[in-house]
C-alpha cells in the first residue's frame, strides 16, 4: 500500500542506504559502498539525488529508473 | 535561529480543558510538520500527533484520539494542543518539535502540565 | 504498534571512555531510526537521523549503526556535556514509537 502523509516517518529511504530530506518532499538517497548488484528495488519517487557509487552494479536495463523523475 | 517557544507550566483542574501553545519563530511555519509528544514524570516519550501547518491535516495517535485536538494558526506561526476532560494521567510535560521527512530537528522546551484540584 | 526496547536503563561511564547504547525494535524497521539526547533540564536534541546521519552541529564522536531490528548509538571520548538521558525512537510506521531512554551518568 501507498505511505501514509506524514512528516515523522522515515519513508522512501531504500534499506540500509542513508537518506536526508532536501526540502519538503524530496530526499538525498546515498546507497554508495553497500555491496549492491542491483539498483534498490523501492527507491521513492520523490529521491532527488541517488549515490550508487562503490557497488557491483555492472549493467543497468533501459529506463532502469521509471518511477523516478 | 529556529525557535518553538512553549509556556513553562499550567494548572488545571481535573474535569476541565486546556489548550497549549507553541509559537515558531526563525523558520517558514508552513514548510515544516510539528510534531506533539508527551512525557509522565521520570518517564519516556510518547508521540501524540502530528499536524501539517500548510493545510491542518493531522495524523494522531489511536491512544489520543478524543484526548487531543491539534491546530495552528498560521498567521501569528504557533501550533496549538487541546487536551480535554482532563485526569492527571495527563499530567505530564507536553512538547512541540517540527519535522521534515521525519527529521525530528528542533523540540520546545516543553510545557509542564498539572491536573490538580 | 511497535515496541522499541533499551534493555539498559542507566550505564555509568568515565570521561574518556566508549559508550554504546542500544535499541531494538519489535520488527524489522529498515533503518528508519533516530536518537536523541535529552538533558537533565528537559532540553531534547535530535543527534542522528535515518540511522546513521548525524545532525549538523553534533560533534563526530557520536555515530549510529545497526540493521533490522537491532540498533545502537556510539559516543567516542565521552564528555561532560553528553550526560543526558538517550532515547531512540522508530520513524518506520505509525505511531512512531520510542524506547525507554538510556540514562548515562558519570563513573
Known amino acids: 500500500g501507498s505511505s501514509p502523509r506524514s512528516g515523522v516517518l522515515l519513508r522512501g529511504c531504500p534499506t540500509h542506504c542513508h537518506c536526508e530530506p532536501d526540502g519538503r518532499m524530496l530526499l538525498r538517497v546515498d546507497c554508495s559502498d553497500l555491496g549492491l548488484s542491483e539498483l534498490p528495488s523501492n527507491l521513492s519517487v520523490f529521491t532527488s539525488y541517488l549515490d550508487l557509487s562503490m557497488n557491483n552494479i555492472s549493467q543497468l536495463l533501459p529506463n532502469p529508473l521509471p518511477s523516478l523523475r | 535561529q529556529v525557535q518553538l517557544q512553549q509556556p513553562g507550566a499550567e494548572l488545571v483542574k481535573p474535569g476541565a480543558s486546556v489548550k497549549l501553545s507553541c509559537k515558531a519563530s526563525?523558520?517558514?511555519?508552513?514548510?515544516?510538520?510539528m510534531q506533539w509528544v508527551k512525557q509522565r514524570p521520570g518517564q519516556g516519550l510518547e508521540w501524540i500527533g502530528e499536524?501539517?501547518?500548510?493545510?491542518?491535516?493531522?495524523n494522531y495517535n489511536q491512544k489520543f484520539q478524543g484526548k487531543a485536538t491539534l491546530t495552528v494558526d498560521t498567521s501569528s506561526s504557533t501550533a496549538y494542543i487541546q487536551l480535554s476532560s482532563l485526569t492527571s494521567d495527563d499530567s505530564a510535560v507536553y512538547y512541540c518539535?517540527?519535522?521534515?521527512?521525519?527529521?525530528?530537528?528542533?523540540w520546545g522546551q516543553g510545557t509542564t502540565l498539572t491536573v490538580s484540584s | 504498534d511497535i515496541q522499541m526496547t533499551q534493555t539498559t536503563s542507566s550505564l555509568s561511564a568515565s570521561l574518556g571512555d566508549r559508550v554504546t547504547i542500544s535499541c531494538r525494535a519489535s520488527?524489522?524497521?529498515?533503518?528508519?531510526l533516530n536518537w536523541y539526547q535529552q538533558k537533565p533540564d528537559g532540553t531534547v536534541k535530535l543527534l542522528i537521523s535515518y540511522r546513521s546521519r548525524l545532525q549538523s552541529g553534533v560533534p563526530s564522536r557520536f555515530s549510529g549503526s545497526g540493521s533490522g531490528t537491532d540498533y545502537s548509538l556510539t559516543i567516542t571520548n565521552l564528555e561532560q556535556e553528553d550526560i543526558a538521558t538517550y532515547f531512540c525512537q522508530q520513524g518506520n510506521t505509525l505511531p512512531p514509537t520510542f524506547g525507554g531512554g538510556t540514562k548515562l551518568e558519570v563513573r
Open positions: 499536524i501539517d501547518p500548510s493545510d491542518s491535516y493531522t
Open positions: 526563525g523558520y517558514t511555519f508552513t514548510d515544516y510538520w
Open positions: 520488527q524489522d524497521i529498515s533503518n528508519r
Open positions: 518539535a517540527r519535522s521534515l521527512s521525519g527529521s525530528v530537528d528542533y
